[in-house]
Interface confidence: low
């Protein structure tokens, strides 16, 4: 036969605890019902009457089963660099998260306390690791044969265009400039290219000076790596 079910309020057996969604009231010395999320204890239980619950007032909430005398106050309104991703209701606190282009520099239990703009990689640097809700963009210098000519928190380093005839060689912050015939890009593997000038690939050359008006035959000179700290703006 099943054990007899006790209804709240009831005195627990010595050494036993109250059941799920019940609490032990020290004054009444009884197991009493908790209030559901969105409610609070209006009247505490006695030996003969159970907890009386009431709905939370506007701008207050309880998220858990509880026996608190007053609901918690919802957090303040979201700031201009934030968006409200969860409204203040009787059962949940307001949650503010960072708007697009920003990340959370200082988080709180739920949502974000302080948002900061995502780092922008300056020309010559591209995004190595995109920003997330909680982490900033990581920039890296564009490797030889690639460039970025933008100040951006999203642009990666792109390959230089492959020219039939190079007017100005590309560098980390500028695409190659072609002349005469139309260029082809070295995007797809197996792409057919016309013969090109042999690229000089010595490992530790210094950045090339601004090209003169004379055409250059060495159009893939590796750039000396710039320190990553210099690759961003807005710090």
């Amino acid at each position: 036969l099943p054990a007899q079910v006790a209804f709240t309020p009831y005195a627990p057996e010595p050494g036993s605890t109250c059941r799920l969604r019940e609490y032990y009231d020290q004054t009444a010395q009884m197991c009493c019902s908790k209030c559901s999320p969105g409610q609070h204890a209006k009247v505490f239980c006695t030996k003969t009457s159970d907890t009386v619950c009431d709905s939370c007032e506007d701008s207050t909430y309880t998220q858990l089963w509880n026996w608190v005398p007053e609901c918690l106050s919802c957090g303040s309104r979201c700031s201009s660099d934030q968006v409200e991703t969860q409204a203040c209701t009787r059962e949940q606190n307001r949650i503010c998260t960072c708007r697009p282009g920003w990340y959370c520099a200082l988080s709180k239990q739920e949502g974000c306390r302080l948002c900061a703009p995502l780092r922008k990689c300056r020309p010559g640097f591209g995004v190595a690791r995109p920003g997330t809700e909680t982490s900033d963009v990581v920039c890296k210098p564009c490797a030889p044969g690639t460039f970025s000519n933008t100040t951006s928190s999203t642009d990666i380093c792109r390959p230089h265009q492959i020219c039939n005839v190079v007017a100005i060689p590309g560098n980390a912050s500028m695409d190659a400039v072609c002349t005469s015939t139309s260029p082809t890009r070295s995007m797809a593997p197996g792409a057919v290219h016309l013969p090109q000038p042999v690229s000089t690939r010595s490992q530790h050359t210094q950045p090339t000076p601004e090209p003169s008006t004379a055409p250059s035959t060495s159009f893939l000179l590796p750039m000396g790596p710039s320190p990553p700290a210099e690759g961003s703006t807005g710090d």
Epitope: R19, L20, R21, E22, S36, C53, W65
Partner: antibody, heavy 127, light 109 residues
Framework: QSLEESGGGLVKPEGSLTLTCAVS?????????ICWARQAPGKGLEWIAC????????AYYASWAKGRLSISKASSTTVTLQMTSLTAADTATYFC????????????????????WGPGTLVTVSS | IEMTQTPSSVSAAVGGTVTINCQSS??????LAWYQQKPGQPPKLLIY???YLTSGVPSRFSGSRSGTEFTLTISDLECDDAATYYC????????????FGGGTEVVVK
Amino acid sequence: QSLEESGGGLVKPEGSLTLTCAVSGFDLNSYYWICWARQAPGKGLEWIACIDGGSTGSAYYASWAKGRLSISKASSTTVTLQMTSLTAADTATYFCARVQSYVGYANYGYPNYFNLWGPGTLVTVSS
Amino acid sequence: IEMTQTPSSVSAAVGGTVTINCQSSEDIDSYLAWYQQKPGQPPKLLIYHASYLTSGVPSRFSGSRSGTEFTLTISDLECDDAATYYCQSAYYSSSADNTFGGGTEVVVK
């Protein structure tokens, strides 16, 4: 502990039917919710509605079922599902299932894990 | 909430392993159940809250979650495991239906 559905059978289109779920081995109280689900022949499962086994009478429905299907607690051992304006698309085996609730102010049988099922009753809607 | 279950059918030999996936259209936390249903029988709850086995279910069954993607794995497959398996979002909100996936038939060779 078991559940058993009854009331199924052949019904004409636009007709009505009331299915009954009888519980045994446990009492319908606030510790349980009773839910209905259905399964068309050779098809998947579809949740319909749930009702508090306690005294609150709280019930909630799948969005498609609101208005046409009605769940109610008939007694301490039975829950019914009233169905109106039936169509051929309602042809299915109808199951009742139990969801464990919680002691106290259990507004919802949450989360809804159907841990005890009846064998089902077949409803055929055809002229 | 929509639950997309794949594959619709899978076949494996006795002693093998099968994996069934269920993708939720919304974040349902870990509120997901897996059921086993054999022909002419009601479903049987195997796993609840994404990874917890119900009493009496062998440990050959396991569930996991990664974001909104859930997986049921049956290892050391037995003939008795031949059935249709359903995932179900058990997430309750007043606007969300408790939704079942389309089902996966497991054939044991």
